[in-house]
């Protein structure tokens, strides 16, 4: 069974561990970190806040940020549910994923195409990322049109979630 | 190498296992469970049915439900492809993810904004969840407007999928 | 602890390994493979090209294809950001995921509902797949309306990503 001796594989022979099985086990990618947070009830700025009583394991939450505690490759996904009372003109909904306050990825969708007088329009927007993150890296979400995120009707629908895919020990 | 001794990490020293390496291996998060099911050809109710000849490993399928066999933290994702023959009014498409018959998360999108007489409108809707699930937990999907899920032209596009991220043995 | 002796679980007793701990470790699902590629700046055909200087680990990139190097169950996800200058008629945006040049899954959404003269419409489309892939399997993405993928305004938004969930050694 040929397992290439890359950083994420167990060095079964040689390396620092050689035949030391406890050492081998220590080097194995057993570590798991994850988070699943729902948006806070009352939003008052473009940077979204989250309920810190969600699922948090090996990750911290602080001031609207998820803060990484273990380095590695993370899968990050955010999903938002919008409810727009259509004005006269079209509306561009935008979701920005920020890493250390820098925009890493965004998703945009246009609703209320011009002239449409509908009572309301629902729109769902999601965004994902697969990225190496270091300790103390912050993850946050920005939404210009945060007033359209319906936290009362849909308190469970707006979430930010991450999980560690491969640790870099 | 500081690996915190949390439930999902291998207790390399102490605990029940101590230096017993077979025990340590048993406690390691090797278990994998997953499913990837396509929607059934003929839908006749709001609770969607699935083709049980899809990918199923460590998960059971029964009466429209995925049934958990191993406890742990699961990533759940559902994606649906809609085809709507627009009526005079707008249509709200809704996808509900249910855990043990309780709505856990939903996604909504409005199509056919009022007055638009188009032959047809395509819409794609997805929903994800990261959650701890116990043995015998059921996962199901509800769609009020199931008649708009085009299972004939797009039989492969409507799927429910899960995978175990971290087991809780 | 009852771990079923299936291909993705470690046979803690019996099998080829029995009590041989190094063998057991070799059989454990430690292998990790992943990719996260952004779309190439200049698109000139319906089969999308990707920046090969993205994240690639245990996967090759060649001629618009991700090429699998280790067999197993992969999670595949693609997300595209469209910007459409609306013509007189509606536009169907389609994203196809191809495995070995066969259509495996597609996502469609209609924008610019008839008669709407908007300056521009944003739309975001994603598609995922969980599938067993063999060595040398190719993964590619096809978009008929590739001219609407805005690679200049949104160079980071259009991505193809995969990760190995369970290897089949």
């Amino acid at each position: 069974d040929s397992i290439p001796n890359s950083p994420d594989n167990v060095p079964l022979k040689g390396g620092d561990c050689s035949e030391d099985l406890l050492c081998i086990l220590k080097r194995a990618p057993f570590k798991k970190s994850w988070a699943y947070l729902q948006v806070a009830k009352h939003l008052d700025k473009t940077k979204l806040s989250w309920n810190k009583d969600g699922i948090l394991h090996g990750v911290r939450y602080q001031d609207g940020n998820l803060v990484i505690q273990f380095p590695g490759l993370y899968f990050i996904i955010c999903q938002l549910q919008f409810l727009v009372q259509c004005p006269q003109n079209s509306v561009d909904l935008k979701l920005e994923l920020l890493i250390n306050k820098h925009i890493k990825k965004q998703a945009l969708v246009t609703v209320c195409e011009s002239g449409m007088q509908t009572k309301h329009v629902y729109q769902n927007l999601s965004q994902f990322l697969l990225d190496y993150l270091q300790v103390d890296t912050t993850i946050s979400v920005n939404v210009d049109t945060f007033q359209y995120i319906d936290t009362s009707t849909f308190p469970l629908e707006n979430v930010l979630s991450i999980f560690l895919y491969s640790n870099s020990d | 190498d500081s690996i915190p001794n949390s439930p999902d990490n291998v207790p390399l020293k102490g605990g029940d296992c101590s230096e017993d390496l077979l025990c340590i291996l048993k406690r390691a998060p090797f278990k994998k469970s997953w499913a990837y099911l396509q929607v059934a050809k003929h839908l006749d109710k709001t609770k969607l049915s699935w083709n049980k000849d899809g990918i199923l490993h460590g998960v059971r399928y029964q009466d429209g439900n995925l049934v958990i066999q191993f406890p742990g933290l699961y990533f759940i994702i559902c994606q649906l492809q809609f085809l709507v023959q627009c009526p005079q009014n707008s249509v709200d498409l809704k996808l509900e993810l249910l855990i043990n018959k309780h709505i856990k998360k939903q996604a909504l999108v409005t199509v056919c904004e009022s007055g638009m007489q188009t032959k047809h409108v395509y819409q794609n809707l997805s929903q994800f969840l990261l959650d701890y699930l116990q043995v015998d937990t059921t996962i199901s999907v509800n769609v009020d407007t199931f008649q708009y899920i085009d299972t004939s032209t797009f039989p492969l596009e409507n799927v429910l999928s899960i995978f175990l991220y971290s087991n809780s043995d | 602890d009852s771990i079923p002796n299936s291909p993705d679980n470690v046979p803690l007793k019996g099998g080829d390994c029995s009590e041989d701990l190094l063998c057991i470790l070799k059989r454990a699902p430690f292998k990790k493979s992943w990719a996260y590629l952004q779309v190439a700046k200049h698109l000139d055909k319906t089969k999308l090209s990707w920046n090969k200087d993205g994240i690639l680990h245990g996967v090759r990139y060649q001629d618009g294809n991700l090429v699998i190097q280790f067999p197993g169950l992969y999670f595949i996800i693609c997300q595209l950001q469209f910007l459409v200058q609306c013509p007189q008629n509606s536009v169907d945006l389609k994203l196809e995921l191809l495995i070995n040049k066969h259509i495996k899954k597609q996502a469609l959404v209609t924008v610019c509902e008839s008669g709407m003269q908007t300056k521009h419409v944003y739309q975001n489309l994603s598609q995922f797949l969980l599938d067993y892939l063999q060595v040398d399997t190719t993964i590619s993405v096809n978009v008929d309306t590739f001219q609407y993928i805005d690679t200049s305004t949104f160079p980071l938004e259009n991505v193809l990503s995969i990760f190995l969930y369970s290897n089949s050694d």
Epitope: - | L83, D150 | K45, T46, K47, L98, H102, V143
Partner: antibody, heavy 124, light 110 residues
């Protein structure tokens, strides 16, 4: 054994609309794509378009502005309308069945059943 | 959409093998493994001979085989017989969910 039979006028005046119907017998019209293909005398085949029983259509881009297809599952029939015809539309018109199966992936089995063809002449 | 390119004619003697090429673009033949081949005798409807590049419908002789490389597909007929004399058309699925035919190749059995 599925059989297809084209019907419609053999002569159409320029600028008018060509209308053809295909009747499916010996099998169900459901779960297939139904296709129209034409062949001018002494020339090659030209794909016009297809319709699924759900009503989804795909048309040849060069003919799209003039083509309309419809399906009537209750009568086991599907139809072609081609507007603003000219002499260049003179051809043998075939209706045909295309089989596509979605299983582990999409399998395209090609056009496996054909009608015998009907000649349409565009002339004043 | 432009027609796929086929040679106007090919010929071969009984028992020989011949190959007909079909060249398309990166949006049809080069994109998918969805290429079909049809045989048409004079005053008859076409008949499906190959689907998905190299698969034969039941009832079609195994003397007919297909392949695909890059933007070009090929039909090979081995052990040529008199009844193989006909017109042959390739067809490919395209990125716009349509089909496109080749211009056709007249096969003459000498």
């Amino acid at each position: 054994q599925v059989q297809l039979q084209e019907s419609g006028p053999g002569l159409v005046k320029p600028s008018e609309t060509l209308s053809l119907t295909c009747t499916v017998s010996g099998g169900s019209i459901s779960s297939y794509y139904w296709t129209w293909i034409r062949q001018p005398a002494g020339k090659g085949l030209e794909w016009i378009g297809r319709i699924y029983t759900s009503g989804i259509t795909n048309y040849n881009p060069s003919l799209k502005s003039r083509v309309t297809m419809s399906v009537d599952t209750s009568k086991n029939q599907f139809s072609l309308k081609l507007s603003s015809v000219t002499a260049a539309d003179t051809a043998v018109y075939y209706c045909a069945r295309e089989r596509v199966v979605g299983a582990s992936r999409y399998y395209y089995y090609g056009v496996d059943v054909w009608g015998q063809g009907t000649t349409v002449t565009v002339s004043s | 959409q432009s027609a796929l390119t086929q040679p106007a004619s090919v010929s071969g003697s009984p028992g020989q093998s011949i190959t007909i090429s079909c060249t398309g673009t990166s949006s049809d033949v080069g994109l998918y493994n969805y290429v079909s081949w049809y045989q048409q005798h004079p005053d008859k409807a076409p008949k499906l001979m190959i689907f998905e590049v190299n698969n034969r419908p039941s009832g079609v002789s195994n003397r007919f085989s297909g392949s695909n490389s890059g933007n070009t597909a090929s039909l090979t007929i081995s052990g040529l017989q008199a009844e193989d004399e006909a017109d042959y058309y390739c067809s490919s699925y395209t990125s716009s969910s349509t089909w496109v035919f080749g211009g056709g190749t007249k096969l003459t059995v000498l």
